[in-house]
């Protein structure tokens, strides 16, 4: 799940079995000119960045779990 | 590589109490969860609870509530569990077990220690 | 508090047989449950988790399946040193419950 920082696609790959508990935020990248696929990247409660499937029903499910509550906050 | 390492057997008067610890080795110790669990002589597993040491955050169940008490020293990367009020229901086998950050799985675990309340 | 049920209790089998343990949980927990595998005298083992993703060093020989309620866990061509306790673990919704626990034998 590590995750690069230049100007291409940031995923070289994901993390399976993600749990929302220790997620803290999450950065949903949509495709650009530097990264053809959407890109979801995760900071967990220690800091650490996490790729996550963006194909994933879970990932799905905290992706929308996350924008409820900012919207709610 | 990541080791827990449970401090040894206590044998304890019913009405007193004790503190156990766990030192942890081979990681960011702050960054993880910890977790306790209690297995009673022939019985199954029991989650007690948890703390985020970089924090101190404590998540507990509420079975367990009043009864343990979970507290972390980064300084010396060691997680402890006083147990208070001991009866003989508290004589068990306790382990700590570290919680992985990103899938929350309990991938390491101690040896244990047996602690007995007997008069 | 999510309950767990697991079954058999115990169960003997031979080795290079198969055996399968089932845990119904007592609501959707999301395929996050793990298997841990119990020996005397030593800390649990995690095999599996999040329903079916093998714990490194773990081998191919188990295997788990499920999703919403039920789920089961599998190893197959038994050998000697599988004869262990195993639990279940629900960990979708805080306290994180366990099964009973299988406790496992050899014919």
């Known amino acids: 799940a590590s995750v690069a920082t230049e100007l291409r696609c940031q995923c070289l790959q994901t993390l399976q079995g993600i749990h929302p508990k220790n997620i803290q935020s999450v950065n949903v990248k949509s495709p650009g000119p530097h990264c053809a696929q959407t890109e979801v990247i995760a900071t967990l409660k220690n800091g650490r960045k996490a790729c996550l499937n963006p194909a994933s029903p879970i990932v799905k499910k905290i992706i929308e779990k996350m924008l409820n509550s900012d919207k709610s906050n | 590589q990541v080791q827990l390492q449970q401090s040894g057997a206590e044998l304890v008067r019913p009405g007193s109490s004790v503190k156990i610890s766990c030192k942890a080795s081979?990681?960011?110790?702050?960054?993880?969860?910890m977790n306790w669990v209690k297995q009673r002589p022939g019985q199954g597993l029991e989650w007690i609870g948890q703390?985020?040491?970089?924090?101190?955050?404590?998540n507990y169940n509420g079975k367990f509530k009043g009864k343990g008490t979970l507290t972390a020293d980064k300084s010396s990367s060691t997680a402890y569990m006083q147990l208070n009020s001991l009866t003989s229901e508290d004589s068990a086998v306790y382990f700590c077990a570290r919680e992985r950050d990103y899938d929350v799985a309990m991938d390491y675990w101690g040896q244990g220690t047996s602690v007995t309340v007997s008069s | 508090d999510i309950q767990m049920t697991q079954s058999p209790s115990s169960l003997s089998a031979s080795l290079g047989g198969k055996v399968t343990i089932t845990c119904k949980a007592s609501?959707?927990?999301?395929?996050?449950i793990a298997w841990f595998q119990h020996k005397p005298g030593k800390g649990p083992r995690l095999v599996i988790h999040?329903?079916?993703i093998l714990q490194p060093g773990i081998p191919s020989r188990f295997s788990g399946v499920g999703s919403g309620r039920d789920y089961s866990f599998s190893i197959r061509n038994l050998e000697p040193e599988d004869i262990a306790t195993y639990y279940c673990?629900?960990?979708?919704?805080?306290?994180?419950?366990f099964g009973g626990g299988t406790k496992l034998e050899i014919k």
């Open positions: 081979g990681y960011a110790f702050s960054d993880y969860w």
């Open positions: 673990l629900q960990y979708d919704n805080l306290p994180w419950t």
């Open positions: 999040y329903t079916s």
């Open positions: 703390i985020y040491p970089g924090d101190g955050d404590t």
């Open positions: 609501q959707d927990i999301n395929k996050y």
